[in-house]
Amino acid sequence: KIDACKRGDVTVKPSHVILLGSTVNITCSLKPRQGCFHYSRRNKLILYKFDRRINFHHGHSLNSQVTGLPLGTTLFVCKLACINSDEIQICGAEIFVGVAPEQPQNLSCIQKGEQGTVACTWERGRDTHLYTEYTLQLSGPKNLTWQKQCKDIYCDYLDFGINLTPESPESNFTAKVTAVNSLGSSSSLPSTFTFLDIVRPLPPWDIRIKFQKASVSRCTLYWRDEGLVLLNRLRYRPSNSRLWNMVNVTKAKGRHDLLDLKPFTEYEFQISSKLHLYKGSWSDWSESLRAQTPEEEPTGMLDVWYMKRHIDYSRQQISLFWKNLSVSEARGKILHYQVTLQELTGGKAMTQNITGHTSWTTVIPRTGNWAVAVSAANSKGSSLPTRINIMNLCEAGLLAPRQVSANSEGMDNILVTWQPPRKDPSAVQEYVVEWRELHPGGDTQVPLNWLRSRPYNVSALISENIKSYICYEIRVYALSGDQGGCSSILGNSKHKAPLSGPHINAITEEKGSILISWNSIPVQEQMGCLLHYRIYWKERDSNSQPQLCEIPYRVSQNSHPINSLQPRVTYVLWMTALTAAGESSHGNEREFCLQGKAN
């Protein structure tokens, strides 16, 4: 009821707290001498439900029966309306609609750690919309009982603040929770448990790892646990993995040997504990320990490839290339690569350690049989050396793969296909597909890429270091013993018409014909592999169609003769370039007049 109503009263029957669906009677009555002046029968009492008028009556009192009230609180206000004046509030009352508490479900209790306190949780069931008090009761041996009350509106957790001890771990305790509100009460089913059932150990702490003799094969994990712990679960994984390895151990006493860790790998370790084989629950996982395992000497062998370049009649340049070992093969930080070059007949050998590169270039005589060995070294040792005999990779024409083609295969991929060589195809031990960006100068600094393919394969998809709109020189080598044959082709993953035409830099006259020289189109403007150049010419000031000459593209070519010009006629000449996607715009225009005699 609104406090201290001077003018009248509002009463609610049977109660101001009702069960959902119940009916209430509301009475508004004026106190003596509180009605309208002069004419009491002019009193008009009006009942409002919040701000909505629901009933009115002339006289000293008003009765109203109300049904269908919603869950929660509804305010009823009674007002008096007199002629020629505003309504005035007489009194008001709230009605609280709710439900009795449901039976609390799934009562469960836990004690965190041997020194912790007993705390219980339960499910309240549906909201009562009324103030509901929860009382938790725990009874134990020797008629001991503890009780705790919860005054939080959404109470589903209580801590008794008492500690169960392991003196009699099999003694039974019983917990029960009771919910009470103005409309009723309800108790949970009792939950009976022992010390071992409810004590959840604290997670292990102070986790450490030791590697005896800095070896990954002698690894022990150490930790600390509460005194009564019997079981442990260990889980560990490489830091970059989502999958855990799991180990269960009994009576570990804070240590366990791990035998299957990979070298030079950062691992994450966690441990959990339990007091009893089949009673109680596992602790939370411990905080993670992160540790890197020691290095081991590399396994596997380097993938090595090479290029030979003729320098002069007595010398040749050898460029060696190799790929990094995978992390699992390197098993540590590679400190250097050891390259040994040996002349097989004379026995002369030269060894060099290479750091920071995966290539090495040297100059050797063109005579003799040469071999190289390359290995990778970390702090623990070296990989087995990869040995290669240096030979002329393209010398055996009969071993050359046939019908080599290179086709775009989606974004930044090129599919290279070939047919086996004419010579007995079964003699091929492996194919090597090599590719590098095409540079008109034949630049030896351009990075080399390669992949190896089994002898029964006749195609390879190359995707490493492939960029759109770049032309690649692709070679396929067939290797057999100490012989090799090769075929080459140009290819690109994506192409469009070149952005510019060649720049004519000179036109010279030679015996009645002309020689046109041009500068190559910059690589970044070629937009793929060039197929042809076109030279156009027409008489100056003429409207006739130009004549043209189409020249197949060759990397090293940058001049071409034309012998169909008339003497003493001034011509305008220009050039374009073509890829499979189309023709470039014109290059620069040059004028030229042939001075030779007319026939």
């Epitope: 929660g72 305010l75 103030y131």
Partner: nanobody, 115 residues
Framework: QVQLQESGGGLVQPGGSLRLSCTAS????????MDWYRQVPGNQREWVAS???????YYDGSVKGRFTISRDNAKMMVYLQMNSLKPEDTAVYYC?????????WGQGTQVTVSS
């Protein structure tokens, strides 16, 4: 124990605005309505506005269209935004939480509308 504290009252000219706030403590508030009442000296307290836990507002006819009630359950606050104030709105304004165990009232904040 629930405690309520109003603030934001003051002197304002007719036609002006004020915003009253009521800070509450105690978690039971989240299931109950929160109300504003006002009292002129010598008269009884009169209901002004209510808001349900889900935010449904209700107003007395004398303030409807001028006052707005709102609540922030996370901060346990209820507000009364009063616009187009009139001299007859002068009163002490109280915040109230009605429960089935009894009503909780604040101490009140004075609002004076005068030129």
């Amino acid at each position: 124990q629930v405690q309520l504290q109003e603030s934001g009252g003051g002197l304002v000219q007719p036609g002006g605005s004020l915003r009253l706030s009521c800070t509450a403590s105690g978690s039971i508030l989240s299931i109950y309505n929160m109300d504003w009442y006002r009292q002129v000296p010598g008269n009884q307290r009169e209901w002004v506005a209510s808001i349900t836990p889900s935010g449904d507002p209700y107003y007395d006819g004398s303030v409807k269209g001028r006052f707005t009630i709102s609540r922030d359950n996370a901060k346990m606050m209820v507000y009364l935004q009063m616009n187009s104030l009139k001299p007859e709105d002068t009163a002490v304004y109280y915040c109230k939480v009605p429960t089935e165990k009894g009503n909780y009232w604040g101490q009140g904040t004075q609002v004076t509308v005068s030129s």
